[in-house]
């Protein structure tokens, strides 16, 4: 066991928050300010991320973990680890290359981010539109038109058959 250990890379003993310093006989040196190592055995420490400008610091950098950023109000995170901040739009809008634009008729967006999506097509489910859609809200689908005929109810028995040519009163 001892022989195996001696053959190991001496750097493997360096814990997170340190690096294996080649300039000092491979001893474990603490990460310098503004840097970190999140795993053991590293030969260099990584530069801390800065959260400036549109970014805000959510978590400070430490010797063992990178800083974490979020976005200033009016912007939201995009990408892994909030690598970008994208402009918020109002509900009923979507972000285009030219800025925030209102949703086209027949589409909606109920969030401050993302794209406008088409209103639900109620008829595809055999239903009718109960509440019309807006730029900010999807349509609300209701019962199918057939379900809305007078007397129609899940508890009433079906109406007696009528002679052809007669419509319901």
């Amino acid at each position: 066991f001892e022989r195996t250990r001696s053959l190991q890379d001496p750097c493997s003993n360096c814990p997170a928050g340190t690096f294996c310093d080649n300039n000092r006989n491979q001893i474990c040196s603490p990460c310098p300010p503004n840097s970190f190592s999140s795993a053991g055995g590293q030969r260099t420490c990584d530069i801390c991320r800065q959260c400036k400008g549109v970014f805000r610091t959510r978590k400070e950098c430490s010797s063992t973990s990178n800083a974490e950023c979020d976005c200033t109000p009016g912007f939201h995170c995009l990408g892994a680890g909030c690598s970008m901040c994208e402009q918020d739009c109002k509900q009923g809008q979507e972000l285009t290359k030219k800025g925030c634009k209102d949703c086209c008729f027949g589409t909606f967006n109920d969030q401050k981010r993302g794209i406008c999506r088409p209103w639900t097509n109620c008829s595809l489910d055999g239903k009718s539109v109960l509440v019309n859609g807006t730029k900010e809200r999807d349509v609300v689908c209701g019962p199918s038109p057939a379900d809305l005929s007078p007397g129609a109810s899940s508890v009433t028995p079906p109406a007696p058959a009528r002679e052809p040519g007669h419509s319901p009163q």
Partner: antibody, heavy 118, light 110 residues
Framework: QVQLQESGPGLVKPSETLSLTCTVS????????WSWIRQPPGKCLEWIGY???????NYNPSLKSRVNISVDTSQNQFSLKLNSLTAADTAVYYC????????????WGQGTTVTVSS | QSVLTQPPSASGTPGQRVTISCSGS????????VNWYQQFPGTAPKLLIY???QRPSGVPDRFSGSKSGTSASLAISGLQSEDEADYYC???????????FGCGTKLTVL
Amino acid sequence: QVQLQESGPGLVKPSETLSLTCTVSGGSISSYYWSWIRQPPGKCLEWIGYIYYSGYTNYNPSLKSRVNISVDTSQNQFSLKLNSLTAADTAVYYCARTHSYYYGMDVWGQGTTVTVSS
Amino acid sequence: QSVLTQPPSASGTPGQRVTISCSGSSSNIGNNPVNWYQQFPGTAPKLLIYSNNQRPSGVPDRFSGSKSGTSASLAISGLQSEDEADYYCEAWDDSLNGPVFGCGTKLTVL
């Protein structure tokens, strides 16, 4: 690799508005800050302002009332407007990319000389 | 005029080591990493050191940076004639939410 190119008039009259454009080629404008810096003859570098690709802006307080920076991601360009010019605005104007991780200005345009004179 | 303070000039002979200082305050250097730029006459500045002590690819290891408290320094070892240029320090300033520069140090190789 990414290159920046400033364009605009070399001579502007006092009280007029300076309009400069920086075209980004060889890379995307997304996920970086885009800065304007100027250098009057024989003087220091002065940060004018920056715009983040998604529209967030910030300006040097000493110039804030006269400056507007905008971005056109579809054209891969960003622009500077500086109004109410005086002779003190005579300078070489640089555009630069500011990295959004460590915030160094890692790519610069070659600069354009702007003279304010009647 | 500049928020960061640099000596206006520095000099050295070929092969020597020279250092250029840059001092600021808690709102800039004290709380943020420092970047250094090299500028030759008639050309744009070039990023030389970022995040206190990191060299972009292509920058010789003769150039090194350090920071302590509200001051930073750029060291050039094995000075060469082609190092004659202006050197600027820069750091983010939290009160501005933007970068501030030093006024530059003109390095002369004697």
